[in-house]
């Protein structure tokens, strides 16, 4: 049993790393594989991590972490029973993946204006909380060309834009996804998307 | 506003033992990170003890471990330090410290006034 | 461990000096360093964060500056009420280490 892709692993900076990497041949990761961490300091407790198959060859693994700090360090070994099949080390703080922003809601009673709200994914006891910047993805449902991107370098997690600069009588979707500058993360995962119709009409005078 | 207030400290035997408290206010404790610096008089900070904020992580300075033990108890706000088989260098005074955010757990924006612990025959 | 090593010791400097205290760290910490400010008899108190980011409420003329292992503690104009030990400390790797201090003295 051979480790093709060796493990990269990803942290929210709150309790959960995800580490994935890829076998040399089909493998139940459940069953035949375990990867041990352990936090790099005196003689700190060993945890243990099942992996799932994420495809033929890939394996996915959710460490669970007791609140991860900045100066945290750990030790990574995969092992298929007896036989280490890999040792490395993983930094949290500095491979880190924010959480997707959630709660994401169109309110559409606003005159002119489309506005789009979001919760931010920590709480405010995580320096992540004031360090977001957010991307909210825009498109047309019936023609997946018509797509913008709007980037939100505020804190504030919402955005208004003129009902006008979408299509009347078009139902749209939106998403968003959220990265931390300070340390230089990975963008999270989109949100699930939400619908809403834009039943928008120009003035006459203006038509 | 954040508070943090220390007691416990006092004059004990080489060998002896003391529990130290911290008792919390003006922020939600369960959430944070909470750690004890010392300071021996006229030296400088050293680091003591972390306690993560579900309790389930506890670190301690080589000079301590073994004999020094970190706890919370979420319910009452208070963070404890028990310290046992106390020598001379351990004379010191000992505060308690918060960090700004959870995951900066050594940027203590809040810190006790601090109790004083004196190890001597 | 990772050692963190202050310059200078001590100093004395006039009012409405640039005050500069360095400190540096045996391998690199990124960005991970704090400065502090303990006055004679009180508790320390947080100046900066992040190396360079400045904490709620603190003066204007601190301000810090570095990444790596090279740092700086800057006093724009030295005020009476700066007069103090300054200490950085890493948050990079357990364990937390503290420099050995600077005592700034009014001349």
């Known amino acids: 049993m051979k480790v093709l892709q060796e493990p990269t692993c990803v942290s929210d900076y709150m309790s959960i790393s995800t580490c994935e990497w890829k076998m040399g041949g089909p493998t139940n990761c459940s069953a035949e594989l375990r990867l041990l961490y352990q936090l790099v300091f005196q003689s700190s407790e060993t945890h243990t991590c099942v992996p799932e198959n994420n495809g033929g060859v890939g394996c996915v693994c959710h460490l669970l972490m007791d609140d991860v700090v900045s100066m945290d360090n750990y030790t990574l070994d995969l092992w298929a029973g007896q036989q280490l099949l890999w040792k490395g080390s993983f930094k949290p703080s500095e491979h880190v993946k924010p959480r997707a922003p959630g709660n994401l809601t169109v309110h559409t009673n606003v005159s002119d204006t489309v506005l789009l709200t979001w919760s931010n994914p920590y709480p405010p006891d995580n320096y992540l909380y004031n360090d977001l910047t957010y991307a909210v993805n825009i498109w047309n449902e019936n023609d997946l060309a018509d797509s913008r991107i709007h980037n939100v370098t505020y804190l504030k997690p919402t955005l208004r834009i003129p009902a006008s600069t979408l299509k009347s009588g078009i139902s749209y979707r939106a998403r968003v996804r959220a990265w931390a500058q300070h340390y230089n993360t990975t963008w999270s995962e989109w949100s699930p998307s939400t619908k809403w119709y834009n039943s928008y009409r120009e003035p006459f005078e203006q038509r | 506003q954040v508070q943090l207030q220390e007691s416990g400290g006092g004059l004990v035997q080489p060998g002896g033992s003391l529990r130290l408290s911290c008792a919390a206010s003006?922020?939600?404790?369960?959430?944070?990170?909470l750690t004890w610096v010392r300071q021996a008089p006229g030296k400088g900070l050293e680091w003591v003890s972390t306690?993560?904020?579900?309790?389930?992580?506890?670190l301690y300075a080589d000079s301590v471990k073994d004999r020094f033990t970190i706890s919370r108890d979420n319910a009452k706000n208070t963070l404890y330090l028990l310290v046992n088989s106390l020598k001379p260098e351990d004379t010191a005074v000992y505060y308690c410290?918060?960090?700004?955010?959870?995951?900066?757990?050594?940027?203590?924006?809040?810190w006790g006034q601090g109790t004083t612990v004196t190890v001597s025959s | 461990d990772i050692q963190m090593t202050q310059s200078p010791s001590s100093l004395s400097a006039s009012l409405g000096d640039r005050v500069t205290i360095t400190c540096q760290a045996s391998q690199s910490i990124s960005s991970y360093l704090a400065w502090y400010q303990q006055k004679p008899g009180q508790a320390p108190k947080l100046l900066i964060y992040?190396?360079?980011r400045l904490q709620a409420g603190v003066p204007s003329r601190f301000s810090g500056s570095g990444s790596g292992t090279s740092f700086t503690l800057t006093i724009g104009g030295l005020e009476t009420e700066d007069l103090a030990t300054y200490y950085c400390q890493q948050d990079y790797s357990w364990p937390l280490t503290f420099g050995q201090g600077t005592k700034l003295e009014i001349k």
């Open positions: 003006g922020f939600t404790f369960s959430s944070y990170s």
């Open positions: 410290a918060k960090p700004l955010y959870n995951n900066l757990a050594g940027d203590f924006g809040s």
């Open positions: 992040g190396g360079s």
């Open positions: 306690i993560k904020a579900r309790g389930g992580t506890t």
